[in-house]
Amino acid sequence: FERTRSLQDPCSNCPAGTFCDNNRNQICSPCPPNSFSSAGGQRTCDICRQCKGVFRTRKECSSTSNAECDCTPGFHCLGAGCSMCEQDCKQGQELTKKGCKDCCFGTFNDQKRGICRPWTNCSLDGKSVLVNGTKERDVVCGPSPADLSPGASSVTPPAPAREPGHSPQ
């Protein structure tokens, strides 16, 4: 089949990094500078992506693969193949359509991207707040209020030691 195909279409013999040049009797010509072909049998080479402005080059273009971009510091990638660069915010903020805004009271964001999320509601798990939340950090839940009542120890007693050679029941 391969031999039949190559008899029918001489372009199928052109490897990645070349194109089938109709102007030169379908000879396989190397891709010109700043272009590439990632598969064989191509009749044209694709123009290399240029990483300019807020985009920076993560991987240079070669004759067989396109350039890859990422974003300059202060931005992060969005979209397939880093087609967009979105600004970072500080911890304790979220990106709105009009820019970075502080998290509202009762919410936090511990990352430079994403949205502010509500603090954990400790009481839903029957626990109390051990450390208050901030714009940058969630609350830390501690033992339940009952565990902290007078006379109750907040220290968990150690598990009884097992005798050597005895498997647990």
Epitope: E94, L95, T96, K97, K98, K101, I115
Partner: nanobody, 124 residues
Framework: EVQLLESGGGLVQPGGSLRLSCAAS????????MSWFRQPPETGLKWVSS????????YYADSVKGRFTISRDNSKNTLYLQMNSLRAEDTAVYYC?????????????????WGQGTTVTVSS
């Protein structure tokens, strides 16, 4: 598969006009707010405009207010951006975006699908 396909970009002289379109497929278009964002060559992605699901409420960035108009045709599953009095600083790749459940105004940022973009160049 959810898809957004922009068209209508091109080269235009300062003061000129362009109309961008965004054809949506793979979801119930009339249920969702939609937005336009743009990525200028030298800076990060910027929000341009949003429209609610029905088309009744529209929102604009200060930099385009009075010059750009967002609209939608729910019967054609298409979003539009009419851009008038274009300036050099409007040069960018323009992206159509589907909003999630919270992105109905000019503050919440809740994009869950992006288009592939269309390039607008404003130059004399």
């Amino acid at each position: 598969e959810v898809q957004l396909l922009e068209s209508g970009g091109g080269l235009v002289q300062p003061g000129g006009s362009l109309r961008l379109s965004c054809a949506a497929s793979g979801f119930t278009f009339s249920n969702y707010a939609m937005s336009w964002f743009r990525q200028p060559p030298e800076t990060g992605l910027k929000w341009v405009s949003s429209i609610d699901a029905s088309g009744g409420d529209t929102y604009y960035a200060d930099s385009v207010k009075g010059r750009f108009t967002i609209s939608r045709d729910n019967s054609k599953n298409t979003l539009y951006l009419q851009m008038n009095s274009l300036r050099a600083e409007d040069t960018a790749v323009y992206y159509c975006a589907k909003e999630g459940s919270h992105g109905t105004d000019d503050s919440h940022y809740d994009v869950d699908v992006w288009g592939q973009g269309t390039t607008v160049t404003v130059s004399s």
